[in-house]
C-alpha cells in the first residue's frame, strides 16, 4: 500500500473551466480571432461569446496557436476533454488533433507525449460533442496549453476542460541515474520512460516521471497493467555491477520546507530474477539547493520477509527531519534495484513560501466538479462522489 | 497463494439476467486488470469483458457489448460479472482472469462456474 | 478481427520427444517491437494455465522444457522432452488488437 501517495482513481475531478472555479484571468491565449471568440469563451459546454476560442491565425501548416488555463498550482492533470464552437448549434469549426504543452514554473515548457513518444492527440469529428483523452502518462503541470492543428488551411476552434487533481507531493523534481536494460529471454528496459527532465551524462534531472505517476508495478517485472508498453515498463532499475559504491544515489526537491515523516519506495523482489529490495535506505536533508547537508543522515536497515518474491512498498522512516532537498541512497542487496514508485509522507511547514511562480492562491485538495456525463465518444458514469470518468470501448 | 473463485452461475431462461462475482486474494487486486472469458460447450475460448486496474476502462466484444456489464470494488477485492438478455449462445463456461489489459495475457484463472441458457 | 489458426488440431507425441505447435495470426500481432502472443495450457476439468508470454517469456513456475518463439505472425511452442504430465490441450492468444482472440487449440496425447 502506497500511503501518502495519490491514488490515480481518486484523480479524475474536472478542474474547474466548465464549473467556472478557473476564473477567466487564468485563461488566456496566443490570439482572438474576435473578444466573442477570445480565451475566456473556451469553456467546456459553454455557449458564451461565439461559443468556443477561436485563435487569429491559421494553425496550418505551423501549429503556433495556442490556449492556456492557469491552474495556479501544481495538479496531476490526468484527462482532457475537448469541443468545438456551440454558435447557437450553428458552429461548425472544431480541431481533429491537437498538441499539449506544459509548465510548472512557468519558465521551462514541456511538449506532453504518450507512454510511445506520440504527441498528436485525436480531437473532435465535430462541434458538439466532447472528446476525453485519457493522458497516459498523465502530467504534473500549473500551466497547461493547448495547440489546434490541422492539416490544411482552416478555421478550428475549441472548448476544454482539464480532470486531476491537487499534486499533494509537492515533489518538483527528482535526480536519478539513467535507468538501465537487463538481458533475460528478451531485453528488459528498465529506463524512466517517461522522464520530462534533463538527460546529461547518465543522469536525469529537473524533472518528473514513472517514479511519481502513481502507477505501482507488478510482482513480476517483465509484465505491465499498460496496453501493448515493453517489458520493464513499469520499473526503473539499476545493476549493481555499475555502481561500484554499492548503492544508487538520488536526490528529490520538493516545493517549499516539509516536515518529512516517511519516504514509500515501490521495490520489486522477484529474486529469482536478480530484483532484490534495497537492503538499506540512507537519506541526507537540505532546506536550500545551496545549502550544507545538515546533522546525521537518516538510516534504515530493511528487515521483514526478503524472500517473499512480491512486489512491496518499503516505508522508510525520515523522523520529521525538515528539509527543501533530500538525497537518499538505495543499498544494493542484490544484482538489481528495481523501483515503480516513490512517494514521500510530509507536512509543509508553516510560513514556507513555495519555491516556484510567487505565492499561489489556496486551493481546495478535491476540485468541486464530477466530469460531464454527456460524453458523446466515450461513455461517462460518475458513481456517486467518485470522481470516475468511465471509457467504455477498445482497449488498444 | 494467488486464488479467484467465481459464484453465480446456474440454469437461466433465455432473455433472463444473471450476475457472477469473482473474489479474488493473494495478490494486490487494485494494480491488476481482470478479465472474463467463456469457454463453449466446443471447447473454444472467448474473452467477453475486461476491466483496468482502476475500473474506468471497459471493453466488450461485439457479441456482448450491451448486454454485459463488467465491474469491480477494489475495496472488496471482487471482479462481477452482470449478464442481462442472454441467449443459447451465452452457454458456456465463464472464467475470471487476472489481467487482459496489460502486455502479458492472463496469468491466473479461477476454476470457472457453468451457465446454461435453456428453456 | 485477428483470427489465430493453430496447427495441427491434435498431436501424439512419444514421452521424451519433442512437441511442437504452431499458431498463425490473419495479420501482425507485434506492436512497437514486442509480440502479443501467449500460450496457454488446459487440462481436462481445469481453467487454463498460462504458459509463455509475449511470444518467448515462460511464466513463473512454469518448467523449462515448454519455451515459445515467433513473431508478427508466425509462433510455436515447443515442449522438449514430452511427459505425461503435458497432456492438455494448449491455446494461443493475441493481445495486440481488440477483440483479443483466441486460437482453436491444439490436443496433445501421449502416443
Known amino acids: 500500500d502506497m500511503k501518502g501517495h495519490f491514488d490515480p482513481a481518486k484523480c479524475r475531478y474536472a478542474l474547474g473551466m466548465q464549473d467556472r472555479t478557473i476564473p477567466d484571468s487564468d485563461i488566456s491565449a496566443s490570439s482572438s480571432w474576435s473578444d466573442s471568440t477570445a480565451a475566456r469563451h473556451s469553456r467546456l459546454e459553454s455557449s458564451d461569446g461565439d461559443g468556443a476560442w477561436c485563435p487569429a491565425g491559421s494553425v496550418f501548416p505551423k501549429e503556433e496557436e495556442y490556449l492556456q488555463v492557469d491552474l495556479q498550482r501544481l495538479h496531476l492533470v490526468a484527462l482532457v476533454g475537448t469541443q468545438g464552437r456551440h454558435a447557437g448549434g450553428l458552429g461548425k469549426e472544431f480541431s481533429r488533433s491537437y498538441r499539449l504543452r506544459y509548465s510548472r514554473d512557468g519558465r521551462r515548457w514541456m511538449g506532453w507525449k504518450d507512454r510511445w513518444g506520440q504527441e498528436v492527440i485525436s480531437g473532435n469529428e465535430d462541434p458538439e460533442g466532447v472528446v476525453l483523452k485519457d493522458l497516459g502518462p498523465p502530467m504534473v503541470a500549473r500551466l497547461v496549453r493547448f495547440y489546434p492543428r490541422a492539416d490544411r488551411v482552416m478555421s478550428v476552434c475549441l472548448r476544454v476542460e482539464l480532470y486531476g487533481c491537487l499534486w499533494r507531493d509537492g515533489l518538483l523534481s527528482y535526480t536519478a541515474p539513467v535507468g538501465q536494460t537487463m538481458y533475460l529471454s528478451e531485453a528488459v528496459y528498465l529506463n524512466d520512460s517517461t522522464y520530462d527532465g534533463h538527460t546529461v551524462g547518465g543522469l536525469q534531472y529537473g524533472g518528473l516521471g514513472q517514479l511519481a505517476d502513481g502507477v505501482v508495478g507488478l510482482d513480476d517485472f517483465r509484465k505491465s497493467q499498460e496496453l501493448r508498453v515493453w517489458p520493464g515498463y513499469d520499473y526503473v532499475g539499476w545493476s549493481n555491477h555499475s555502481f561500484s559504491s554499492g548503492y544508487v544515489e538520488m536526490e528529490f526537491e520538493f516545493d517549499r520546507l516539509r516536515a518529512f515523516q516517511a519516504m514509500q519506495v515501490h521495490c520489486n523482489n522477484m529474486h529469482t530474477l536478480g530484483a532484490r529490495l534495497p537492503g538499506g535506505v540512507e537519506c541526507r536533508f537540505r532546506r536550500g539547493p545551496a545549502m550544507a547537508w545538515e546533522g546525521e543522515p537518516m538510516r534504515h536497515n530493511l528487515g521483514g520477509n526478503l524472500g517473499d518474491p512480491r512486489a512491496r512498498a518499503v516505508s522508510v522512516p525520515l523522523g520529521g527531519r525538515v528539509a527543501r532537498f533530500l538525497q537518499c541512497r538505495f543499498l544494493f542487496a542484490g544484482p538489481w534495484l528495481l523501483f515503480s514508485e516513490i512517494s514521500f509522507i510530509s507536512d509543509v511547514v508553516n510560513n514556507s513560501s513555495p519555491a516556484l511562480g510567487g505565492t499561489f492562491p489556496p486551493a481546495p485538495w478535491w476540485p468541486p466538479g464530477p466530469p460531464p456525463t454527456n460524453f458523446s465518444s466515450l461513455e461517462l458514469e460518475p458513481r456517486g462522489q467518485q470522481p470516475v470518468a468511465k471509457a467504455e470501448g477498445s482497449p488498444t | 497463494e494467488v486464488q479467484l473463485v467465481e459464484s453465480g452461475g446456474g440454469l437461466v431462461q433465455p432473455g433472463g439476467s444473471l450476475k457472477f462475482s469473482c473474489a479474488a486474494s493473494g495478490f494486490t487486486f487494485s494494480s491488476y486488470g481482470m478479465s472474463w472469458v467463456r469457454q463453449t460447450p466446443d471447447k473454444r475460448l472467448e474473452l467477453v469483458a475486461i476491466?483496468?486496474?482502476?475500473?474506468?476502462?471497459?471493453y466488450y466484444p461485439d457479441s456482448v457489448k450491451g448486454r454485459f456489464t463488467i465491474s469491480r470494488d477494489n475495496a472488496k477485492n471482487t471482479l462481477y460479472l452482470q449478464m442481462s438478455s442472454l441467449k443459447s449462445e451465452d452457454t458456456a463456461i465463464y472464467y475470471c482472469a487476472r489481467g487482459g489489459y496489460g502486455n502479458y495475457g492472463m496469468d491466473y484463472w479461477g476454476q470457472g462456474t457453468s451457465v446454461t441458457v435453456s428453456s | 478481427d485477428i483470427v489465430l489458426t493453430q496447427s495441427p488440431a491434435s498431436l501424439a507425441v512419444s514421452l521424451g520427444q519433442r512437441a511442437t505447435i504452431s499458431c498463425r495470426a490473419s495479420?501482425?500481432?507485434?506492436?512497437?517491437?514486442?509480440?502479443?502472443m501467449h500460450w496457454y495450457q488446459q487440462k481436462v476439468g481445469q481453467p487454463p494455465k498460462l504458459l509463455i508470454f509475449?511470444?518467448?517469456n515462460i511464466e513463473s513456475g512454469i518448467p523449462a522444457r515448454f519455451s515459445g518463439s515467433g513473431s508478427r505472425t508466425d509462433f510455436t511452442l515447443t515442449i522438449n522432452s514430452v511427459e505425461a504430465d503435458d497432456v492438455a490441450t494448449y491455446y494461443c492468444?493475441?493481445?495486440?488488437?481488440?477483440?483479443?482472440?483466441f486460437g482453436g487449440g491444439t490436443k496433445l496425447e501421449i502416443k
Open positions: 492468444q493475441q493481445s495486440n488488437e481488440a477483440p483479443y482472440t
Open positions: 509475449r511470444a518467448s
Open positions: 495479420e501482425s500481432v507485434d506492436s512497437y517491437g514486442n509480440s502479443f
Open positions: 476491466i483496468n486496474s482502476h475500473g474506468f476502462s471497459t
